[in-house]
């Protein structure tokens, strides 16, 4: 079954996918698609890379990490409920039936209503690197400690996002990274 990731309406969603290039700059084509991975490539492609660069993308979908180092995690900007569903990350390793495919389930939750009349900030827009935090514990504490004046609802939302980010890191650290070569 698919690994599940969550985001709220209006935020940026993060879907992790990694591989380790055999050598620096020795990239492998990758595609991201909406829908489970089919036999070849991706269905309803939203982003594609080749051996050198991102060669196809659609609005709101981008790679926030360093894809030249194998971080091909997908960021979806300003999500709506319609963005819910399964996404396919396919790492097209050359050879006979060598493709690695990952189905990731994105669940979009309605945005929380914030009753406080304080100035609102879109966290993922203000802190776009927040969801790509790699470290555990101290790095996350430091991220929380460096936040500007925000309300409790936003802190709660941030904590949830960091929890989901930690899940992504745990997945990566538990062997979801594909090594090539």
């Amino acid at each position: 079954s698919e690994v599940e990731y969550r985001a709220e309406v209006g935020q940026n969603a993060y879907l992790p996918c990694f591989y380790t290039p055999a050598a620096p700059g020795n990239l492998v084509p990758v595609c991201w698609g909406k829908g489970a991975c089919p036999v070849f490539e991706c269905g309803n492609v939203v982003l594609r890379t080749d051996e050198r660069d991102v060669n196809y993308w659609t609005s709101r979908y981008w790679l926030n990490g360093d894809f030249r180092k194998g971080d091909v995690s997908l960021t979806i900007e300003n999500v709506t409920l319609a963005d819910s569903g399964i996404y396919c990350c396919r790492i097209q390793i050359p050879g006979i039936m060598n493709d690695e495919k990952f189905n990731l389930k994105l669940v979009i939750k309605p945005a929380k209503v914030t009753p406080a009349p304080t100035r609102q900030r879109d966290f993922t827009a203000a802190f776009p690197r927040m969801l790509t935090t790699r470290g555990h514990g101290p790095a996350e504490t430091q991220t929380l400690g460096s936040l500007p004046d925000i309300n409790l609802t936003q802190i709660s939302t941030l904590a949830n996002e960091l929890r989901d980010s930690r899940l992504a890191n745990d997945l990566r650290d538990s062997g979801a990274t594909i090594r090539i070569g």
């Epitope: 089919p38 036999v39 070849f40 269905g43 309803n44 492609v45 050879g95 060598n98």
Partner: antibody, heavy 123, light 107 residues
Framework: EVQLVESGGGLVKPGGSLRLSCAAS????????MTWVRQAPGKGLEWVSS????????YYLDSLKSRFTISRDNAKNILYLQMNSLRAEDTAVYYC????????????????WGQGTLVTVSS | DIQMTQSPSSLSASVGDRVTITCRAS??????LTWYQQKPGKSPKLLVY???TLAEGVPSRFSGSGSGTQFSLTISSLQPEDFANYYC?????????FGQGTKLEIK
Amino acid sequence: EVQLVESGGGLVKPGGSLRLSCAASGFTFSDYYMTWVRQAPGKGLEWVSSINYDGRNTYYLDSLKSRFTISRDNAKNILYLQMNSLRAEDTAVYYCARGYYYYGSSPNYFDYWGQGTLVTVSS
Amino acid sequence: DIQMTQSPSSLSASVGDRVTITCRASENIYSYLTWYQQKPGKSPKLLVYNAKTLAEGVPSRFSGSGSGTQFSLTISSLQPEDFANYYCQQHYGTPLTFGQGTKLEIK
């Protein structure tokens, strides 16, 4: 006009080899996945093998991958299927087909097919 | 492997009839299903892909539906040129697999 023309079929003895070719024209060959599908006399369709745009990724029916090799020459617009250690059960019409494709789609279904070439394996 | 089971295996109908061919997958294939038409001595022709999208140039009397494990191809009003063999094909799991075919004959 898109055209796929297979050749190389014929009568071969069990254990023999054949190389099928599929000459493509009317489209940018290097932009498309290509596939071989076969059909035994009076039977249904069976997928054999597929190859990606640049030939770096290949896919086979498990039971055939030790004997069959798919390849392509994008400079000549030709798709190949090398068949070794042929058996009677490999007797079929072999079709080459183009994987439907545009940016944003996946090439998992086949929009153009050749006329087929008959391979008969018999002693 | 994902097994594709078509029914019926053969069907007799008349010009003007509405006919439906079904295809069942042995596991969930989402909407990754294609329908082909093949006439005797000819190569297959793409009719419908992604379960319900009509291929270019295919008459609107053809329609596809379904998702998951149950799919169907409907011809709303049979024409003489529609008498042929029909195959479904899944493109979710490796290997690609086809149904055994449905032979549509003139009654």
